[in-house]
C-alpha cells in the first residue's frame, strides 16, 4: 500500500526474513503520513510494514546486524 513512494498502510502478512534483502525507514515527519518500514524483497517488491510489530522489529535487527558484519 504505497503511493508516490509513501506507505499508506501496512501488510497483514508476515514476511520471512529469507525473502528480504533490505529495508528503508519511512518517517511521518518527513513528508509521509505514517511511520513505516519498507521491506525490499528478492523479487524486487516493496512491502510496507508496521514498525511497532514484533516480527518487523526482529527482521530490522537481523538485517542491521548483517550490514554491521559485512
Amino acid at each position: 500500500a504505497s503511493n508516490f513512494d509513501c506507505c499508506l498502510g501496512y501488510t497483514d502478512r508476515i514476511l520471512h526474513p529469507k525473502f528480504i534483502v533490505g529495508f528503508t525507514r519511512q518517517l511521518a515527519n518527513e513528508g509521509c503520513d505514517i511511520n513505516a518500514i519498507i521491506f525490499h524483497t528478492k523479487k524486487k517488491l516493496s512491502v510496507c510494514a508496521n514498525p511497532k510489530q514484533t516480527w518487523v522489529k526482529y527482521i530490522v535487527r537481523l538485517l542491521s546486524k548483517k550490514v554491521k558484519n559485512m
Epitope: H16, P51, Y58, I59
Partner: antibody
Amino acid sequence: EVQLVQSGAEVKKPGSSVKVSCKASGGTFSSYAISWVRQAPGQGLEWMGGIIPIFGTANYAQKFQGRVTITADESTSTAYMELSSLRSEDTAVYYCAREDIVGAVDGFDIWGRGTLVTVSS
Amino acid sequence: QSVLTQPPSVSAAPGQKVTISCSGSTSNIGNNYVSWYQQHPGKAPKLMIYDVSKRPSGVPDRFSGSKSGNSASLDISGLQSEDEADYYCAAWDDSLSEFLFGTGTKLTVL
C-alpha cells in the same frame, strides 16, 4: 489454554553452561515470539533475547551477546536458552514468555513459572 | 542499567488511586507500544496493560494506562490489598534494538 512449562532448577559451577527449556503445552509456536527474561534475587526484570520460531533466528540483548544462545524446535513446540561462561552474578530465576508477533496483544501475555539457576563453587 | 525509569516505591490506602510513572525516550516509549506487568513475590510477572492502554481479558478496569510523549503511566484506582506487588513498564527500544523493562516500582497498600 496455552501454558509454558519450564525445566527444573539447576545448580552450576562457575565457568560452566546451563540449558533451560520451555515447552508450549496446549498450543503451537506459530505467529509467536518466545523471549527469555531473567531476574536476579531482589532485582528487576531483564530481557536476554528472543526467537521467532518460524524465522529460526534469535535476537539477543547486547549485554548477553556471545554468551547466550536461544533456539527453538517447532516440532516439539519447545524453546531453549543456553547461557555459557557462568558466573555468580548469573544466579537468577529465568523465565520464558510468549508474545504475539503480529501485535494482537503486544506484550508478554503468557509466562513460564521460572527456572532457578544457582551458580556456586 | 535500564533506560526506563520508574519511582522505586509508591503507597496509598485501600480505595485510593495511585499513579506509577515510567520515563523513557523517543526511541522506546515515544515510538513504541508500552506494556505493564504486575509481579507478586515468588511469582511470574503478569501482563496488565498492553499497547499503552489496552487490558487483557481478566484484568480489572481499575487498571488503566496512558502515554504522553516519552513517558507512560499506570493508574490503579480503588486500591485493594491484592494490588500490593511490584510493577514494571516495558517497551522495545529502536536504538538498542532490544526490549527494555523499567526499573520497577513497589506498590504498598497501607
